[in-house]
Interface confidence: low
């Protein structure tokens, strides 16, 4: 249970950054993920754009408490969730959103964490246990990362929608215009 950044002892730990870092897992009902930002049908993407500078993704602030076993931070921390399609800004959205927005063999751009910051938090524990101090790694900015079809699925999984947008407690319900009907096809849909 709990976030990968923690061990259940008194040590302070900041995990090493991997090339494709995983955002923190959901923390026992206390992570705010902007479910509404989960939405948005992938726009039609009729051609490949080479210039990554044209791509942008959303940096969504959210507040949550850090937990480590039964202990919880005295104050919530604020970090970013990386969200949104990485599409060229000049393209119009597809009204129905049922088509892939990249060429079948073209590049795939994902909105992923770019920079991190470390923050020390004090954890309060039940039963009169001594407070613990932790350093946690928080997402500080996001970027669009260009992938190719040659990236294997384990790499893709690291910043797939379920990782970037924890869905705990969400009941599946139909989306406007049936945009979820072909979610398997739209790998990068939320």
């Amino acid at each position: 249970q709990g976030w990968q950044a923690f061990k259940n002892d008194a040590t302070e730990i900041i995990p090493g950054l991997r090339e494709y870092p995983e955002p923190p897992q959901e923390l026992e009902n206390n992570q705010t993920m902007n479910r509404a930002e989960n939405g948005g049908r992938p726009p039609h993407h009729p051609y490949d754009t080479k210039d990554v500078s044209e791509y942008s993704c959303r940096e969504l602030h959210y507040t949550r408490f850090v937990t480590d076993g039964p202990c919880r931070s005295a104050k919530p921390v604020t970090e970013l969730v990386c969200s949104g399609q990485c599409g060229p800004a000049r393209l119009l959205p597809n009204a129905i959103g049922r088509v892939k927005w990249w060429r079948p063999n073209g590049p795939d751009f994902r909105c992923i964490p770019d920079r991190y910051r470390a923050q020390r938090v004090q954890l309060l524990c039940p039963g009169g246990a001594a407070p613990r101090s932790r350093k946690v790694r928080l997402v500080a900015s996001c970027k669009c990362k260009r992938l190719t079809r040659f990236h294997n699925q384990s790499e893709l999984k690291d910043f797939g929608p379920e990782t970037a947008r924890p869905q705990k407690g969400r009941k599946p319900r139909p989306r406007a215009r049936g945009a979820k009907a072909n979610q398997a096809e739209l790998e990068n849909a939320y």
Epitope: T32, G39, G40
Partner: antibody, heavy 118, light 107 residues
Framework: QVQLVQSGAEVKKPGSSVKVSCKAS????????LNWVRQAPGQGLEWMGT????????TYSQKFKGRVTITADKSTSTAYMELSSLRSEDTAVYYC???????????WGQGTTVTVSS | DIQMTQSPSSLSASVGDRVTITCSAS??????LNWYQQKPGKAPKLLIY???SLHSGVPSRFSGSGSGTDFTLTISSLQPEDFATYYC?????????FGGGTKVEIK
Amino acid sequence: QVQLVQSGAEVKKPGSSVKVSCKASGYTFTDYFLNWVRQAPGQGLEWMGTIYPYHDGTTYSQKFKGRVTITADKSTSTAYMELSSLRSEDTAVYYCAREEEDGQFDYWGQGTTVTVSS
Amino acid sequence: DIQMTQSPSSLSASVGDRVTITCSASQGIQWYLNWYQQKPGKAPKLLIYYTSSLHSGVPSRFSGSGSGTDFTLTISSLQPEDFATYYCQQHSKLPRTFGGGTKVEIK
């Protein structure tokens, strides 16, 4: 049908606090973000913050951070917005609004007029 | 914060006119733009979301277009009930921000 019903008008003194309620019905309260937006007389709309009642996660506009607190009572499907250290420029109509999955505010409360006057 | 600028701030038009309102974002917001209609003393009503998707129950004379930083709300044939103030709103980044509004008045 979806309804958001807000509490009645308030008149407050500068420096005091106000707590506005927003009772939701017609949908699963915990499944949607609930936002607060205000509108000063003759002015435009200003977003204040949001809550996700499922686990009480909140996000606030930097402008109001420290002065605004948004809470939710799941048992009554009611959200609350408390604004402290009131000043005359906080005189406005305060709206709650449900946020749909594509980021749109699809249902709004009728508004609560808060007047701050000495 | 992303600034949303609407133009014109007000316009006079007649029933049957084609009306165009523009909304400009201070930075690219892709398609994350909504339009609302507000009448005096009433709460805003959602018209269009995600740049061009019509909210349920909204007449088809309303349409939206644009991407990046420039967006347009068009009323193809203005009806008496359309005289109101219209707001754009971005949800690309927090905080959510609204345009200053465009008041559509009877000529």
